[in-house]
Amino acid sequence: LKGQEFAPSHQQVYAPLRADGDKPRAHLTVVRQTPTQHFKNQFPALHWEHELGLAFTKNRMNYTNKFLLIPESGDYFIYSQVTFRGMTSECSEIRQAGRPNKPDSITVVITKVTDSYPEPTQLLMGTKSVCEVGSNWFQPIYLGAMFSLQEGDKLMVNVSDISLVDYTKEDKTFFGAFLL
Amino acid sequence: LKGQEFAPSHQQVYAPLRADGDKPRAHLTVVRQTPTQHFKNQFPALHWEHELGLAFTKNRMNYTNKFLLIPESGDYFIYSQVTFRGMTSECSEIRQAGRPNKPDSITVVITKVTDSYPEPTQLLMGTKSVCEVGSNWFQPIYLGAMFSLQEGDKLMVNVSDISLVDYTKEDKTFFGAFLL
Amino acid sequence: LKGQEFAPSHQQVYAPLRADGDKPRAHLTVVRQTPTQHFKNQFPALHWEHELGLAFTKNRMNYTNKFLLIPESGDYFIYSQVTFRGMTSECSEIRQAGRPNKPDSITVVITKVTDSYPEPTQLLMGTKSVCEVGSNWFQPIYLGAMFSLQEGDKLMVNVSDISLVDYTKEDKTFFGAFLL
């Protein structure tokens, strides 16, 4: 199509056109997590701010009860950063009797839930051992990729330890998705 | 709209269409930072290469004086990676008298400046404690997310310690944005 | 163009329009790497799953022999995450005779190959020293940015040590690109 004059009567496209401004989009930011009941054998899900500050949802992309609800089928770019902070982990101590310690770790998972599927699907995982020598440590895990989603799919962010999530600033921990 | 034949007389869109190729876009790459005066109480801003090698700006997205200038309102995906390198940090020493040391850290912030606002807005922050045992350490911090920006907004990348930024290669430290 | 009614006879665009759904896109996921011959003085390239599970290629974006083949010129967002895992590196041992050890490191490079160029171009690099105190360590390196690519360009992901790549789960190690 390079350099070719646009003419409505000679439209070289293979599917209906779509204005970019009306595509489903969301950027959610961290809020303090209140203690809640989590599913057994599943990392706890974070809940999010969806309208204050930098956070927004638009064009039928809705946030409800820890989930982003996908309003139409298509390819989405999905991303999240979670900043963790904690105290020195045990694995940084001198290893006793030559027996190496199992490292502590931090993990973020972006999960897709489809009502017709019994099991959630893990789309993205960032996992890191934490063996810091200093007393207080902090670090982010960033994830982002493109996935084909169906209308009605739900997205959430799960973390290995909800009490280590840095909830202090909206620019440190966030979650978003947009239709490509 | 799936599988439906496109016809100009039956255009199912809700806003004016826009060719993707003319959207504002930029990818900036690292250059060596020379000692300069920084604003008090603010992390120093990096300056960037905007036309050589992999770097480019296009479609009215301009780079000037450490800032990317947003030429039109809309939702932008903004990203940056900064690779830091340094020597062993003090917090990796044996903790004296049981008193834990405050860890050294590295931080990247993507900041938005709006002329009508007195204060810059921090859009994204990646911050990490550095307690390395080896002599030379190096590591990247990556950030990326979507934000609603207004025409005239300016974006910059600030870092906690400008002298630790790895400026040797354009693929290690970079900054970009594109209109969705 | 804000708020203006769309009319085919009054199309305010500067280039031919393009339906989003037919743009080249791919998301590739990790598979176990089989030992192969690598180019001298170049990090080994990973090979990928391109159709099972979360992986897909579409709209003429093809995967073949470790490469993503770019089917049309334009600006692409390219991303990858590689999760590494290994045993304690030597540099975490007590430094003998006051001589600091050279740190081990892990590196990911997204590389572009253009047939008319003799040398590959490194688009993105994430590199990190590894000086872990615990016995087993694991951590991801994430990269993503926008580049102007030409039809026929080929993309690959190279890593410093293929034997340290975590190939166990498709959400831990992945590679993707999409036309903007």
Epitope: - | P35, H38, P44, D161, S163, L164, Y167, K169 | -
Partner: antibody, heavy 118, light 107 residues
Framework: QVQLVQSGAEVKEPGASVKVSCKAS????????MHWVRQAPGQGLEWMGW????????NYAQQFQGRVTMTRDTSISTAYMELSRLTSDDTAVYYC???????????WGQGTMVTVSS | DIQMTQSPSSLSASVGDRVTITCRAS??????LNWYQQKPGKAPKFLIY???RLQSGVPSRFSGSGSGTDFTLSISSLQPEDFATYYC?????????FGPGTKLEIK
């Protein structure tokens, strides 16, 4: 513009100490590492060490360990290098230098000649 | 410590000549290699960083290349003001070390 202005020439006896100052202007003093490099007459360049003006942290070359002390006064944007137990081998021009990154030297002072002679 | 060697130690050339100076590190220093120019009685001047990237304000007749252990500094067409001593310096790890220098003289 960025400038480093060093103190004047010194003549010292063996066994004495010398303290050279380096006043910085035109940039944020605490944001960039300050290095000290010396050059004996007719010889090459020898890195002595650095100070991080923000934290006061230092890194000295092994051959100067125990003899050199680098300090700074952020209120007057000045770095200092003190070398003790001087011998005739320490006769040299001493430069302060600042880098945009910690591993290189963008801007140099004019140099301070230190002569050690009995 | 990383040792830096330079060759030649001195070099005679004429205005307009192309000259090349080599620098070798005793172990890999990646691209953390800098070049300086020094004239008699003056402080060194920073020329090239990251092995191949020209410092702002340095004429384009200067160029650098190399990675790992072997590096070169080239001057494409010598000008009268280029006659000086050139030093390489590794910034990979401390102690930072300089090469012994190459003295470029007028033939």
């Amino acid at each position: 513009q960025v400038q480093l202005v060093q103190s004047g020439a010194e003549v010292k006896e063996p066994g004495a100490s010398v303290k050279v100052s380096c006043k910085a202007s035109g940039y944020t003093f605490t944001a960039y590492y300050m290095h000290w490099v010396r050059q004996a007459p007719g010889q090459g360049l020898e890195w002595m060490g650095w100070i991080n003006p923000k934290s006061g942290g230092t890194n000295y070359a092994q051959q100067f360990q125990g003899r050199v002390t680098m300090t700074r006064d952020t209120s007057i944007s000045t770095a200092y290098m003190e070398l003790s137990r001087l011998t005739s081998d320490d006769t040299a021009v001493y430069y302060c230098a600042v880098g945009g990154s910690y591993d290189a030297f963008d801007i140099w002072g004019q140099g301070t000649m230190v002569t050690v002679s009995s | 410590d990383i040792q830096m060697t330079q060759s030649p130690s001195s070099l005679s050339a004429s205005v307009g000549d192309r000259v090349t100076i080599t620098c070798r590190a005793s172990q890999s220093i990646s691209s953390y290699l800098n070049w300086y120019q020094q004239k008699p009685g003056k402080a060194p001047k920073f020329l090239i960083y990251g092995a191949s990237r020209l410092q702002s304000g340095v004429p384009s007749r200067f160029s650098g290349s190399g990675s790992g252990t072997d590096f070169t500094l080239s001057i494409s067409s010598l000008q009268p003001e280029d006659f000086a001593t050139y030093y390489c310096q590794q910034g990979h790890s401390t102690p930072f070390t300089f090469g012994p220098g190459t003295k470029l003289e007028i033939k």
